[in-house]
């Protein structure tokens, strides 16, 4: 009886999660005389196997980051080894799991920002990559400022775009940053995958040194005032 796991030779597509040890067959192809055996070719990577009787299976865990789709061909042969049916395309789509952590491209970033810069205008980007599928939460990154050093009166002078990693001044930062009082800051920034929404997310951390420079226009006005 034909069912979900057996049937005649025809083009088929199967989806299998990466990282899982083989637990069941993929498919049992049924031979129609004069076909007596089956043959598998294509991107098998020595993982996919077909037995002579048509049993298609895989022998070890798949890795989407190595190959996201395996394009295979199955043919039916007669007793003389001549192809009598096929080959037909068999497509194995490897589904993503969260098996890679995001990684910042740099362990330390350096940037400068002029005092009174417009709030929300990026002056520096931090960037992380994740080998997992960006179309799934596994590869969707969430950036966050863990801490700002120094923290003056519990006021955050810097903010980060959670999706892009763009760092800019907050409204308070635009108004209050003063290189004469404190010319340098440090941010500890984390990135999490799973969009930052899961306890099972992976993370990485980087350090950002920021120099605050004087507002030239303000200095210019000040200069003219005294002359």
């Amino acid at each position: 009886q034909e069912g979900k796991f057996s049937g005649p030779l025809k083009p088929m597509t199967f989806s299998i999660y990466e990282g899982q040890e083989p637990s069941q067959i993929i498919f049992q192809f049924k031979a129609n005389p004069p076909a007596v055996t089956f043959e598998l070719t294509g991107e098998t990577d020595n993982i996919f196997v077909i037995e002579r009787e048509g049993l298609l299976y895989y022998n070890r865990a798949l890795d989407r980051e190595t190959r996201s789709t395996h394009n295979l061909q199955v043919a039916a042969l007669d007793a003389n080894g001549i192809i009598v049916e096929g080959p037909v395309p068999i497509t194995i789509k490897v589904k993503d799991i969260n098996d890679n952590r995001p990684t910042f491209l740099q362990s330390k970033y350096e940037g400068s920002v002029r005092q009174n810069s417009r709030p929300g205008k990026p002056f520096l980007y931090v960037n992380a990559t994740d080998l997992d599928d960006p179309a799934t939460p596994n590869g969707q990154l969430y950036y966050q400022i863990v801490i700002q050093l120094p923290m003056i009166n519990n006021v955050m002078y810097f903010q980060i775009n959670n999706k892009t990693g763009a760092i800019s001044l907050t409204r308070e930062g635009s108004q209050e940053l003063n290189p004469a009082k404190n010319p340098s800051y440090n941010l500890v920034i984390s990135v999490k995958d799973m969009g930052g929404q899961s306890e099972n997310s992976f993370s990485d951390t980087t350090s950002v040194d920021i120099i605050v420079t004087e507002n030239i226009w303000k200095a210019h006005k000040h200069h003219h005032h005294h002359h």
Epitope: Q144, N186, S207
Partner: antibody, heavy 122, light 107 residues
Framework: EVQLQQSGPELVKPGASIKISCKAS????????LNWVKQSHGKNLEWIGL????????SYNQKFKGKATLTVDKSSSTAYMELLSLTSEDSAVYYC???????????????WGQGTSVTVSS | DIVMTQSPATLSVTPGDRVSLSCRAS??????LHWYQQKSHESPRLLIK???QSMSGIPSRFSGSGSGSDFILSINSVEPEDVGMYYC?????????FGGGTKLEIK
Amino acid sequence: EVQLQQSGPELVKPGASIKISCKASGYSFTGYALNWVKQSHGKNLEWIGLINPYNGGTSYNQKFKGKATLTVDKSSSTAYMELLSLTSEDSAVYYCARWDGNPHYYYAMDYWGQGTSVTVSS
Amino acid sequence: DIVMTQSPATLSVTPGDRVSLSCRASQSISDYLHWYQQKSHESPRLLIKSGSQSMSGIPSRFSGSGSGSDFILSINSVEPEDVGMYYCQNGHSFPLTFGGGTKLEIK
């Protein structure tokens, strides 16, 4: 005077989980990050992670992902570290330590708690 | 991760000696290097931060030097109460890492 007072020693069975506390006093709790450090065999020091009491932001050493969870209670100026699914490898002294708040002194730990000894044994 | 390597593992000295403890980082960490002292049954104590900045209350015989990947903690006249473990810490990038320590003992 800055003080970090940690909870007492723990003797637990393998597979159990515990929560260690670190009560801060003598400074503005939300103004400084708190770190947790593991010391095994009275020697090696390993940084577990940090938490910012101001916003609850955390950074973990990936080696301790799934092993340690850091939280704070601002109302009591207390930081907590939960250690999960303990094994004999987790037997150690655990310290909380405050970061120097000055960006010029990158991530120096200027005040330390007295340590909490955790022994995992059946 | 940045690996911090300390040497020697043990240093046996006579009171009054000048000693140097070495710490090497696996990559350049500028001057983002901190030194801690840990006496028996005590918590670590910050001695030197950012390579050479002494903490207040630390005796002047302790000094730090170095930049990049090689650092030295010097004690210019060792006293008996200086016995204990000395650790260096990478303050440059995450995860923060410590050296394996140097044990200072009196002969």
